[in-house]
Interface confidence: medium
Amino acid sequence: QLPPGKPEIFKCRSPNKETFTCWWRPGTDGGLPTNYSLTYHREGETLMHECPDYITGGPNSCHFGKQYTSMWRTYIMMVNATNQMGSSFSDELYVDVTYIVQPDPPLELAVEVKQPEDRKPYLWIKWSPPTLIDLKTGWFTLLYEIRLKPEKAAEWEIHFAGQQTEFKILSLHPGQKYLVQVRCKPDHGYWSAWSPATFIQIPSDFTMND
């Protein structure tokens, strides 16, 4: 029977800068029941607080709801593991919510083949930002990436769309069925998951000639 091993805070994520969750991995339990607590303070302050919500994020997590989330402050947190034989602490983790945003995937992905008479045909792709993100405040800049491929192909073709929420693609293989997906990323944060795939059949008479 031993004191617990050192826990490790391995991830923090926020869907929108308004709430966030951090997760830890327990160390060895030393063969005894072990209790875990996450404590934190804000940079420049000495007052320590305990995790406000150990439930919402699932096992070995701490969730910070709206009332506990400040955008312009750095949180300094650590996890304490305790059993009858002693305690151990994780390394301190510094968290500024700006740097942990991982949005939900973009919504309402629409794909259409456009064949104007006077110009080249193209694939028109349009989407909406995820609902939890409020772009009107100016706090957020979302960048988008599109990927597409013929249904049976192994390799994805990737296009960076910048801040646009629509995109045109000119070079496609006629007669093929394509999968199209989009994802988004805030300026300092993480890429979202890819949106569910939308399928589009490219007509056989779709021509890439001038």
């Epitope: 490790e8 805070i9 391995f10 991830k11 923090c12 991995r25 750095t74 390394d91 983790l93 510094y94 968290v95 500024d96 919510v97 740097y99 942990i100 993480y190 890429w191």
Partner: antibody, heavy 123, light 110 residues
């Protein structure tokens, strides 16, 4: 406990290539930025390159830009440095270093280091 | 190129207090934190001070760090023979998008 074990060093001719590996254990490799730092014989430390936790962001020192490529395989807990067009001035001990988890600006440092692998570029 | 400036050498007698300086610019020390490493002969560097003044567990409180403007310093009090090593300061440089080191200071315990 955290362990970083470099391999792949050796003697190579100018203009040649070498691929260094760093096997990591004792921590959640996929959560951390990782870096390469080198030290020429009898000289100081020089940062070479860093890669983000997911592998999507990479940064290089000007002295190696366009010649070296950093990458990682999170499924194998391994960091790589592909070194092409090697020059005599690339001769050094190459250290693999872990960057602590920190989600804020201006915090960048190296909390664990491997023992290093020697790369000698000479004809 | 060495971006942060350190004195090449420093020395002191056992029990003495020694200070090593590190000078940078607004794009590194001026806007980011400073870290210090100790490299004993023939070994890999070891983190000594992080975020200007924090000590990792296991580092004695004889070692302390401070930062002011675009300069930082490492102080070692109660100098011991085992402190004889090379000491490097390091920061992040926002304009280079990378890490920068000082040239190192060789500390001799007389």
């Amino acid at each position: 406990q955290v362990e970083l074990l470099e391999s792949g060093g050796g003697l190579v001719q100018p203009g040649g290539s070498l691929r260094l590996s760093c096997a990591a254990s004792g921590f959640t490799f996929s959560s951390y930025w990782m870096s390469w730092v080198r030290q020429a014989p009898g000289k100081g430390l020089e940062w070479v390159s860093s890669v983000s936790d997911t592998g999507t962001d990479t940064h290089y020192a000007d002295s190696v830009k366009g010649r070296f490529t950093i990458s990682r395989d999170n499924s194998k807990n391994t960091l790589y440095l592909q070194m092409n067009s090697l020059r005599a001035e690339d001769t050094a001990v190459y250290y693999c270093a872990k960057t602590p988890l920190a989600y804020s600006s201006g915090w960048y440092y190296f909390d664990y280091w491997g023992q290093g692998t020697l790369v000698t570029v000479s004809s | 190129d060495i971006v942060l400036t350190q004195p090449p050498s420093a020395s002191g007698t056992p029990g003495q207090r020694v200070t090593i300086s590190c000078s940078g610019s607004s794009s590194n020390i001026g806007s980011n934190t400073v870290n210090w490493y100790q490299q004993l002969p023939g070994t890999a560097p070891k983190l000594l001070i992080y975020r200007n003044y924090q000590r990792p567990s296991g580092v004695p409180d004889r070692f302390s760090g401070s930062k002011s403007g675009t300069s930082a310093s490492l102080a070692i009090s109660g100098l011991r023979s085992e402190d004889e090593a090379d000491y490097y300061c390091q920061s992040y440089d926002s304009s280079l998008s990378g890490s920068v080191f000082g040239g190192g200071t060789k500390l001799t315990v007389l």
